[in-house]
Interface confidence: low
């Protein structure tokens, strides 16, 4: 059994933890039906120009398509996922279980998201997961709201191979990229990890039913929620220790996709979707 | 262009295995996904398998114990190897390419294979 | 598995008619994963449709796809002689096709 809740993030890097400016935050507020309506034509191209997108998402539509098909008999399990929320399509689920996959994939894709936002134009030229960030991001949003009351979660992640500095006590900071965290401690502890986070989150959505590893109990939050650094330490031998607490969110980009595609001649009115 | 061309044999033998072959010109097979798809006579379609051009393979599961797919992306082909054939195995024979998801957006013309004894 | 069902098996139209064409889903389909297909006998299918409404390149305006959830609808607004041909429905996020619909001369 594999634990990519920590295998997610083998680097061998110190790095601050500050507001991750450089990260691309989009929150798709006002468009996600026009980006919705452009997917199919995004994604053709993104999987033209990354061989291993292309294949986590065929291996993660097969997975779909076969859990799709077990559905009724998981409805009878008392370990059942809840049904999917109101407005959540297939191609969410093929993301979420394309991004949680043993994969090379969840390693590119977050150090290409911590890059994407150093200008508009690195995201419109250079970033070529348009259609996995917005499909996680809608996502995380439908499966946030889809929960009654909305929730916010403790949740454990541990990262091997990278120390994060907290920018200094009290600090705001943001985790920079899509995080995956644990609601069990010892999963998140599995691999002797270097840094070991405790996060309250609210903007973190539990995936267990869409995830490659439903054992995991994994919460995946997105790169715009904020947090206050609660406490820090460092042991000379053992992992650094961060806490976290949910702030809010902040994002530094909107809609930069349809903005480009859509509002190039004339005034451009987004909606409300 | 890009234009898809199957070759292989027009009658096999029963209990033999089949071997196609599809050339893609006119565009790298590079980062595209490419499908076998077959039409019985008279009949609807039925979807084989698919392959990438880093060998990933992904078959229609009524098929999968029998089918096998490769590709060889220096000389531009991608092949299906279908074994333990039958009559009922009897039909036209499509290349075609993956575009976005798993539609066919580019078809060949299609190879007539009869299995006879 | 999803099955798809298209009707009618046939459908009998003369040139410049209206014709409409239904794929039923034997459960729900997300309207991003329905194709259509058009097939003139001795070739090889073309595809129409793509995300149960866009265009594929080079299709003219007359054919328009809609639908969601289980049933979809493809239509071709004012037949023309080319038209005439068999058309199948296509689910694909597994691959799957439809019977087809034969739309022949009245």
């Known amino acids: 059994q594999s634990h990519p809740i920590t295998r997610r993030d083998l680097f061998s890097q110190e790095i601050q933890l500050d507001m991750a400016l450089a990260s691309f935050d989009d929150q798709y507020a006002g468009c996600a039906a026009a980006m919705t309506a452009a997917l199919p034509d995004l994604n053709h191209t993104e999987f033209q120009a990354n061989q291993v997108y292309a294949d986590s998402w065929t291996l993660a539509s097969s997975q779909w398509q076969e859990r799709q098909a077990r559905w009724p008999e998981w409805s009878l399990s008392p370990t059942r996922p809840s049904p999917p929320p109101l407005g959540f399509r297939d191609e969410h689920g093929v993301a979420l279980l394309a991004y949680t996959a043993n994969s090379p994939l969840h390693k590119e894709f977050n150090a290409a998201v911590r890059e994407a936002g150093r200008s508009r134009a690195h995201y419109l030229h250079h970033f070529s997961f348009k259609t996995l960030h917005f499909l996680l991001t809608e996502a995380l949003q439908l499966l946030g709201s889809g929960q009654r009351p909305p929730r916010c979660h403790q949740v454990f992640r541990g990262v091997h191979g990278l120390r994060f500095r907290p920018a200094g006590p009290r600090a705001t900071v943001r985790l920079g990229g899509f995080a995956s965290a644990s609601l069990k401690h010892v999963a998140a502890q599995q691999f002797g990890e270097d840094t070991f986070f405790g996060i309250w989150t609210c903007l973190g959505a539990p995936i267990k039913g869409y995830s490659f590893f439903p054992g995991e109990e994994e919460v995946l939050i997105p790169p715009f929620e904020t947090f206050q650094v609660i406490n820090a330490s460092r042991l000379a031998q053992g992992p650094a220790r961060i806490y976290l607490r949910a702030l809010g969110k902040h994002s530094t980009y909107n809609c930069e996709y349809i903005k480009d595609k859509k509002c190039k001649s004339g005034p451009c009115h987004l909606d409300n979707s | 262009q890009v234009q898809l061309q199957e070759s292989g044999p027009g009658l096999v033998k029963p209990s033999e295995t089949l071997s196609l072959t599809c050339t893609v010109s006119g565009g790298s097979i590079s980062s595209y996904y490419w499908s076998w798809i077959r039409q019985p006579a008279g009949k609807g379609l039925e979807w084989i398998g698919r392959i990438s051009t880093s060998g990933f393979t992904n078959y229609n599961p009524s098929l999968k114990s029998r089918v096998t797919m490769s590709v060889d992306s220096s000389k531009n082909q991608f092949s299906l190897k279908l074994s333990s054939l039958t009559a009922a195995d009897t039909a036209v024979y499509y290349c075609?390419?993956?575009?976005?998801?798993?539609?066919?957006?580019?078809w060949g013309l299609g190879t007539m294979v009869t299995v006879s004894s | 598995e999803i099955v798809l069902t298209q009707s009618p098996g046939t459908l009998s139209l003369s040139p410049g008619e209206r014709a409409t064409l239904s794929c039923r889903a034997s459960q729900s389909v997300s309207s991003s994963y329905l194709a259509w297909y058009q097939q003139k006998p001795g070739q090889a299918p073309r595809l129409l449709i793509y995300g149960a409404s866009s265009r594929a390149t080079g299709i003219p305006d007359r054919f328009s796809g809609s639908g969601s959830g289980t049933d979809f609808t493809l239509t071709i607004s004012r037949l023309e002689p080319e038209d005439f041909a068999v058309y199948y429905c296509q689910q694909y996020g597994s691959s799957t096709f439809g019977p087809g619909t034969k739309v022949d001369i009245k």
């Open positions: 075609a390419r993956d575009g976005w998801g798993r539609v066919f957006d580019i």
